[in-house]
């Protein structure tokens, strides 16, 4: 969001004021409340960064994120027998990603058409609400998953219905919290017509009174409460997990688990470094600069950081891969273009052939789909 200027009386991601209606006269539009942007912001809004780079990234996120998270949700809901807490958190993570990614075609079209939003006020608000909602949901569910992974290593007890119910309760609480904290994004007017550029922006230019104080306070609160605190919990969980894994006995099975745990840690760390840290940091810096100077010199960086934050929808499937045995099976087979059922039939027929040749016992892979802890 950048700062726009209202040119009537008073008044991002440019400062502006809630604009009035407009009516067409001749070849142009006569606006009743006008927003003006500075030259740097105008160059960003019309430049290759927002009209070429962003659509490319969002297209990649959509093409990768939609099927992978769709498959993950399907696996966790219908192909996983035991609904462990980890499965519940990952299912919610996949759902959050899907709810954000399904709106990406509109976002892609918006940027390709020179940051011109033609889909109306309500859709813009939904897109923005889901965009930020996804980021903060991902952070919180990732934190829950990380803490839960550590808890399993410390307390390797069997699956209990109580644990699953607690995980469902925590998930519902997270959804409710995110819904509450994103209310301002749904309430505030996000679309603004920029006469100089002849475009209607969605979230890229926001009203001045709102930006100056409220938006800085809003994103600072979110950065502390929904980013820094969960990040600290996640880091602590993984540090303790590494310590536990180091001191544990080393057999072939635990070595596999340890390697997978390390891969998971690296994936989550990458997600924080690429997606969550730059966006949360730049959200605060960007709005601080607008609050103090009336314009943001980090606007281009802020745009890139927010864009990269959507990559979490592509990185999350790797988390599912390292955590869920079921997702691993389905992902491998999906990539090899064959169904899990076909693989299992192959395994069963292979087993029976071996049985007929040798009279020794041979156990096939379990048909019960497991989730590795």
């Amino acid at each position: 969001t950048i700062q726009g200027t209202n040119r009537s009386s008073k008044g991002r991601s440019l400062i502006g004021k809630v604009d009035g209606t407009s009516h067409v006269t001749g070849k142009g539009v006569t606006v009743e409340t006008v927003f003006s942007v500075d030259e740097f912001s105008a160059s960003v809004l019309t430049g290759k960064l927002t009209t070429v780079f962003l659509p490319i990234v969002y297209t990649i996120v959509f093409v990768v994120g939609l099927p992978s998270n769709g498959m993950a949700l399907w696996v966790f809901l219908f192909r996983t027998k035991k609904k462990h807490p980890a499965v519940i958190y990952m299912a919610n993570l996949a759902l959050a990603d899907l709810l954000s990614v399904i709106w990406f075609p509109l976002k892609i079209a918006y940027h390709i058409h020179g940051n011109n939003w033609i889909y109306g006020e309500a859709l813009c608000n939904v897109l923005i609400g889901f965009f930020y909602g996804n980021m903060y949901c991902s952070i919180l569910f990732m934190t829950c998953l990380s803490v839960q992974r550590y808890w399993v290593i410390v307390n390797p007890m069997g699956h209990s219905r109580k644990k699953a119910n607690i995980a469902i309760g925590i998930s519902l609480a997270i959804w409710l919290l995110i819904l509450l904290v994103t209310i301002p994004l749904y309430v505030v007017k996000q679309t603004i017509f920029i006469p100089a550029l002849n475009i209607t922006t969605c979230h890229d230019v926001l009203p001045e009174q709102l930006l100056v104080g409220d938006m800085f306070n809003y994103f600072l609160s979110l950065a502390i409460g929904v980013f820094l605190f969960p990040a600290f919990l996640t880091a602590s969980a993984y540090v303790l997990m590494i310590r536990m894994l180091r001191s544990s006995a080393m057999d072939e099975n635990s070595e596999k688990k340890r390697k997978r745990a390390i891969k998971l840690i690296v994936t989550v760390l990458a997600m924080y470094l690429i997606c969550f840290t730059p966006s949360n940091l730049l959200l605060v810096v960007h709005y601080f600069l607008i609050k103090s100077q009336g314009q943001s010199h980090v606007y281009a960086l802020y745009i890139v950081a927010l864009c990269l934050s959507t990559l979490n929808s592509c990185i999350d499937p790797f988390v599912y891969y390292f955590v869920s045995h079921d997702f691993r099976d389905h992902a491998k087979n999906a990539l090899l273009c064959r169904s899990v059922r076909t693989v299992k039939q192959m395994q069963v027929s292979l087993t029976s052939k071996k049985h007929s040749r040798k009279s020794s016992s041979y156990s096939s892979s379990s048909t019960t789909v497991k989730t590795s802890y």
Epitope: T5, S36, P195, N198, V212, G294, Q295
Partner: antibody, heavy 119, light 106 residues
Framework: QVQLVQSGAEVKKPGSSVKVSCKAS????????VIWVRQAPGQGLEWMGV???????YYAQKFQGRVTITADESTSTAYMELSSLRSEDTAVYYC?????????????WGQGTLVTVSS | EIVLTQSPATLSLSPGERATLSCKAS??????LDWYQQKPGQAPRLLIY???SRATGIPARFSGSGSGRDFTLTISSLEPEDFAVYYC????????FGGGTKVEIK
Amino acid sequence: QVQLVQSGAEVKKPGSSVKVSCKASGFSLSSYGVIWVRQAPGQGLEWMGVIWGNGNTYYAQKFQGRVTITADESTSTAYMELSSLRSEDTAVYYCARWRGYKDYPFDYWGQGTLVTVSS
Amino acid sequence: EIVLTQSPATLSLSPGERATLSCKASQNIYKYLDWYQQKPGQAPRLLIYNTNSRATGIPARFSGSGSGRDFTLTISSLEPEDFAVYYCLQHNSGWTFGGGTKVEIK
């Protein structure tokens, strides 16, 4: 070099309209906006409205409904029409060039057009 | 609407003296303030834009400072041609001119 040349002085009757022209040279009207400012005798400057290079316009609340700003790219001329004239509209009307962005000033001005409204 | 208040209304000084003109905004306008000079029968002329940037061809004796709500135009040593009316203009939220300060020969 950049120049804005305005039309000559006008004497109008109350209730009538006046159309002041502003011919631009040394720059393209499609790349720059033109703003209009007026100054009543012995008074300060008062901002009236703007037309952007793409034809979009915005008028100060005080003049909304009475003022119309247009531009003709083929002749590089901007126009300001003020209707329902009253005696208090007697003023010198200036046009000025504006880049169209928040951080740009009104860098070049026309010489001004005196409009006298008298019965 | 943002109101700009210029002071003093009239400044009586002799050539060679330093002139300090003030412009106060009713709310924060950041750096978005310009200064214009107007001589009798002439159009306004841009001196300073965005608080402290000198326009093309403007002598170094003209300088601008301030931010937020308080702004100052300083003429370090008045030349005979500097006696005129000076207007400030804010362009952060709407375009509004100040009432003007007349710099006259004492």
